[in-house]
Amino acid sequence: IWELKKDVYVVELDWYPDAPGEMVVLTCDTPEEDGITWTLDQSSEVLGSGKTLTIQVKEFGDAGQYTCHKGGEVLSHSLLLLHKKEDGIWSTDILKDQKEPKNKTFLRCEAKNYSGRFTCWWLTTISTDLTFSVKSSRGSSDPQGVTCGAATLSAERVRGDNKEYEYSVECQEDSACPAAEESLPIEVMVDAVHKLKYENYTSSFFIRDIIKPDPPKNLQLKPLKNSRQVEVSWEYPDTWSTPHSYFSLTFCVQVQGKSKREKKDRVFTDKTSATVICRKNASISVRAQDRYYSSSWSEWASVPCS
Amino acid sequence: RNLPVATPDPGMFPCLHHSQNLLRAVSNMLQKARQTLEFYPCTSEEIDHEDITKDKTSTVEACLPLELTKNESCLNSRETSFITNGSCLASRKTSFMMALCLSSIYEDLKMYQVEFKTMNAKLLMDPKRQIFLDQNMLAVIDELMQALNFNSETVPQKSSLEEPDFYKTKIKLCILLHAFRIRAVTIDRVMSYLNAS
């Protein structure tokens, strides 16, 4: 058993049929010695008396808010949560496996630049009685500070018969140098509590590996005289690290017809303009990627080809 | 320490070209190592990230763009002095700071070159003959060093009398390649910045 936060404790259980469970001793936080009784949740049934209560925690029925009283007055609470371990593996029931970029990916993180700010998100089908707490650091043995905000519900989607909820959190490394060469990864730890179930999820990454620039901005077309060619121009996104001559991007320009089956014309360039051929009903799209370190491409910025 | 915004410098172009070749070569070599050594811990997640130039050179600090010198997190108190001549400079007006930056890059390349050559000698003794360093990568390191053209004492190649542990050597190769790729990215960024300045 360990303390998650004040008056909230996590009991780690090996979860299998007829498992013996864990013996837990609760102590009432009071100077009083006599006349103390214990109850669980809203029940008035007295579970025991005395300053300490010893319980055998085997299942969720044994978890919950234990309260010690004296003469009708509440003295203190202890909330017990369960953390299940099945076949030596901690349960991951609360969050959905996003399977990207690999299986058992519960947390996904992205950074728009090298400033040390990043966003992580996760998915769940659970809509109520759910809380998250996020901590982060650079490295684990001698951790350096990363400050994370509160996790918030950022999107709701309908997937078949289920609703899916996306939560996200923003974090900022306390003293980040955009030009630094990372040797210690960022660690992100998410504590998830659903009703009386506790789970924790972690992710470890270098900012350089989770870079995904915003799409290029101010995408414009200039038709060339007596030609169905156009000069496409764009600018670096505002959120990208500066100076741009140091943090350079490379770009992919795509001409895509109306139907997905149509051949796509693609041009790769380090410049912020390109000449492409417009096709009927086509759109021109441009996306960006760090020129020197191949992390993710940005989403496409698009304009109709007319 | 920072790179001042200097006048356009025609001597920078060869260095930019060589640094781009360097990044391509080390990225290809790392990819080859990951594929060939698929049963060894050779991915970014599996290896320890070591920097053989740590406390010997200070390329990131010495080559910091002017715009980032206002960022206190980027300023490191380490002081390093370097030799200040080099053909990528091409102009007498080129500042001491830029010379410091380029000579730091040169020292990085020299250190990695020695490590890679030593390692290749060991890998050539491996009866499995599983992996060797790409000669193209070694040649590209050499070309960039020549373009930088700093006078420096040659570092003797390390020789070892004991029987090499090939497993450890291959893991060390992965560690070195990952670190060198990161440094090659920094070098490319620096050359691009100097070229645009």
């Epitope: 007596n226 169905r228 109306k258 009927k280 007319s306 | -």
Partner: antibody
Framework: QSLEESGGRLVTPGTPLTLTCTVS????????MNWVRQSPGKGLEWIGA?????GTAYANWAKGRFTISKTSTTVDLQIASPTTEDTATYFC????????????????WGPGTLVTVSS | AVLTQTPSPVSATVGGTVTIKCQSS????????LSWYQQKPGQPPKLLIY???TLASGVPSRFSGSGSGTQFTLTISGVQCDDAATYYC???????????FGGGTEVVVV
């Protein structure tokens, strides 16, 4: 910039025929080329086109009856099995724009070549 | 697509104005992929107007084009004897296979 059609002659029905349009002064890799025909005393009929990238398109009535192909300086129109209805002057015409859409304006035109199908 | 040209033939007097209409059974690509041609006997057609209203190089300014979508007009103001010819419209569409000429309008100058 000039175009000239050749290969027009008298043929018997069912005898395959290939017409050739020879171009000069521009590149077929940047222009779309069209074939148009005109039966005696009648209007213009668009047959089909081959675009700068080698893609072809045909009028719905012409599909399966005609095939358009090109080399670096010529554009061919193959008539698989001519009938008397195919008697006409055949013109080749270039798309006016560089990298023109199919259906863009046609300019310049060749002088035409006459095909007579008769038994 | 079917392009219907009206009227045909049309008679004009020197110095007068002639209007030829071209109606498309479907909307041309981007509302303006329509061109006009002049053809004289024994000659290939000659481009007059493209993109519905843009005058081709070397074409006298008495020729003008207008319209959008499915309805287009070629106007010859200040008709000259040399304008006696047959005029065709050509439409381009979303589907390339729908590309077609109108039936033609013969202009007789008296």
């Amino acid at each position: 910039q000039s175009l000239e059609e050749s290969g027009g002659r008298l043929v018997t029905p069912g005898t395959p025929l290939t017409l050739t349009c020879t171009v000069s002064g521009f590149s077929l890799s940047t222009y779309t080329m069209n074939w148009v025909r005109q039966s005696p005393g009648k209007g213009l009929e668009w047959i089909g086109a081959i675009s700068y990238d080698g893609g072809t398109a045909y009028a719905n009535w012409a599909k399966g009856r005609f095939t358009i192909s090109k080399t670096s300086t010529t554009v061919d129109l193959q008539i698989a099995s001519p009938t008397t209805e195919d008697t006409a002057t055949y013109f080749c015409a270039r798309g006016f724009y560089v990298y023109a859409y199919i259906g863009d304006a046609f300019d310049p035109w060749g002088p035409g070549t006459l095909v007579t199908v008769s038994s | 697509a079917v392009l219907t040209q009206t009227p045909s033939p049309v008679s004009a007097t020197v110095g007068g104005t002639v209007t030829i209409k071209c109606q498309s059974s479907q909307t041309v690509y981007k509302n303006n992929l329509l061109s006009w041609y002049q053809q004289k006997p024994g000659q290939p057609p000659k481009l007059l107007i493209y993109l519905a209203s843009t005058l081709a190089s070397g074409v006298p300014s008495r020729f003008s084009g207008s319209g959008s979508g499915t309805q287009f007009t070629l106007t010859i103001s200040g008709v000259q004897c040399d304008d006696a010819a047959t005029y065709y419209c050509l439409g381009g569409y979303d589907d390339d296979a729908d590309t077609a000429f109108g039936g033609g309008t013969e202009v007789v100058v008296v």
